[in-house]
Amino acid sequence: RSRWMKRYLTYRIYNYTPDMKREDVDYIFQKAFQVWSDVTPLRFRKLHKDEADIMILFAFGAHGDFNYFDGKGGTLAHAFYPGPGIQGDAHFDEAETWTKSFQGTNLFLVAVHELGHSLGLQHSNNPKSIMYPTYRYLNPSTFRLSADDIRNIQSLYGAPVKPPSLTKPSSPPSTFCHQSLSFDAVTTVGEKIFFFKDWFFWWKLPGSPATNITSISSIWPSIPSGIQAAYEIESRNQLFLFKDEKYWLINNLVPEPHYPRSIYSLGFSASVKKVDAAVFDPLRQKVYFFVDKHYWRYDVRQELMDPAYPKLISTHFPGIKPKIDAVLYFKRHYYIFQGAYQLEYDPLFRRVTKTLKSTSWFGC
């Protein structure tokens, strides 16, 4: 089933039913979206103009899509599964009498159902589910999603994300800066940078003094400690984590089902037992995997390892000597971590431009 590939979604109420006050309609949709955001990492923002991910409209009969409304009764509304344009939108039959009570057709209950479709849910054959195809009145003030509904929506988007516990937003302790600190893996995650080490990771916003730390298991219970390589494809909100012969996909900060998978499915030869470091270059749409003295190149568009790999790191990355602990892509440069140091590398001119302490990101 299709689903949104991002966590932050917009909606717009394109027009209003004359059956109700505008402010009541606004409040009902806010509460209907909240039903789904309460049990997922999804967040919804209302737009007042322009195209939103989820456009909401009230219409009679033929109204511009491939499904005509049938007058009072029968089909109350329909919605479109996630995607661009009409996909994701929700249409309500104006022939119904929309209300906020048990009389007529309760807009809140139908909105929760239709927005379930807008998020990727199909009809359920469980009569207790809000996704059951037949309308029945429930008291909106005591309404709760069924366990089925929660399980189904979380199979698409995962459970709500608890923000990692923040340490005091201050500069790191001097002992931190005096250590010869190395990292297991380093990657961007949205606007943040994650520094993996053993069973935890530090994360911070570049340019901000705050340094935060959390355990891997507290945010992703299914992900093991000792992550060895990581990279992000930001345009897809995808984070890939590697350990030994397995890798995991974190989508919108939620671990994807059907993982871990074997690294050999990516095209590695049997001689590769683990990946030392990985980095995604968005300009080239390639992932570079570093394994001992060699590197491999993976094409994310074709989902194939490029032919003629592996190649020697020292030959194709002048100034870089194996072994590599971690690689970060940031502002068109690669930051190659080796023990207590990192090399800033310009992939355009294929040269090392700086040598820094690996903790320089923390204001050391």
Partner: antibody, heavy 120, light 108 residues
Framework: EVQLLESGGGLVQPGGSLRLSCAAS???????NMWWVRQAPGKGLEWVS?????????GYADSVKGRFTISRDNSKNTLYLQMNSLRAEDTAVYYC?????????????WGQGTLVTVSS | QSALTQPPSVSVAPGQTARITCGGN??????VHWYQQKSGQAPVLVVY???DRPSGIPERFSGSNSGNTATLTISRVEAGDEADYYC???????????FGGGTKLTVL
């Protein structure tokens, strides 16, 4: 009734250009992703290109990237495919298509196609 | 060469069940759509998102998808089902659409 009517096909020499059009009716064109798909004589379907409703996002098959350009005019309910540097292997029937995936069930519509022949 | 692999042809007697496969790496994690194309006509969507049927498509048409294989199943095959069938994958997260090579269904 949903209708898609392609036009602009014909015989063209290798290296030449053609512009295909697809006139849409029976639905709100500006709400929908539109596709071009082609089929060489006796061969299978090959996706060529798609364009998002606003026209701001497009995708191309590797075989046509850099040579073909998809565009749309929502005020005219028309989809276009500008084909440059045409090759013999571009010879095919070109279809425009539209799809909708809703709680009422999926639906897809295709035009009847326009034949492009690239030959000297 | 297509990343989705279909058998070139499948033959079945009327009233029997036809199964057309579509192979692809981890295809079970993707949404697969199936099209029917009769001779000289434009394609018609017969199964969407692995197993959904558009209105007007008989219940005899069904789909499944897991692992590395998606399958279109046509039960109680009729002479009118004779056509080429194509699987197709499209994912919001990638900018490419891929069709399988097509399978010619012959009703004996």
């Amino acid at each position: 009734e949903v209708q898609l009517l392609e036009s602009g096909g014909g015989l063209v020499q290798p290296g030449g250009s053609l512009r295909l059009s697809c006139a849409a009716s029976g639905f709100t064109f500006s709400w929908y992703n539109m596709w071009w798909v082609r089929q060489a004589p006796g061969k299978g379907l090959e996706w060529v290109s798609y364009i998002y409703p606003s026209g701001g996002n497009t995708g191309y098959a590797d075989s046509v990237k850099g040579r073909f350009t998809i565009s749309r005019d929502n005020s005219k309910n028309t989809l276009y495919l500008q084909m440059n540097s045409l090759r013999a292997e571009d010879t095919a029937v070109y279809y425009c298509a539209v799809f909708e995936y809703s709680s009422s069930g999926p639906q897809g519509y295709w035009g009847q196609g326009t034949l492009v022949t690239v030959s000297s | 060469q297509s990343a989705l692999t279909q058998p070139p042809s499948v033959s079945v007697a009327p009233g029997q069940t036809a199964r057309i496969t579509c192979g692809g790496n981890n295809i079970g994690t993707k949404s697969v759509h199936w099209y029917q194309q009769k001779s000289g006509q434009a394609p018609v969507l017969v199964v969407y998102d692995n197993s959904d049927r558009p209105s007007g498509i008989p219940e005899r048409f069904s789909g499944s998808n897991s692992g590395n294989t998606a399958t279109l199943t046509i039960s109680r095959v009729e002479a009118g089902d004779e056509a080429d069938y194509y699987c197709q994958v499209w994912d919001n997260s990638i900018d490419h659409v891929v069709f399988g090579g097509g399978t010619k269904l012959t009703v004996l």
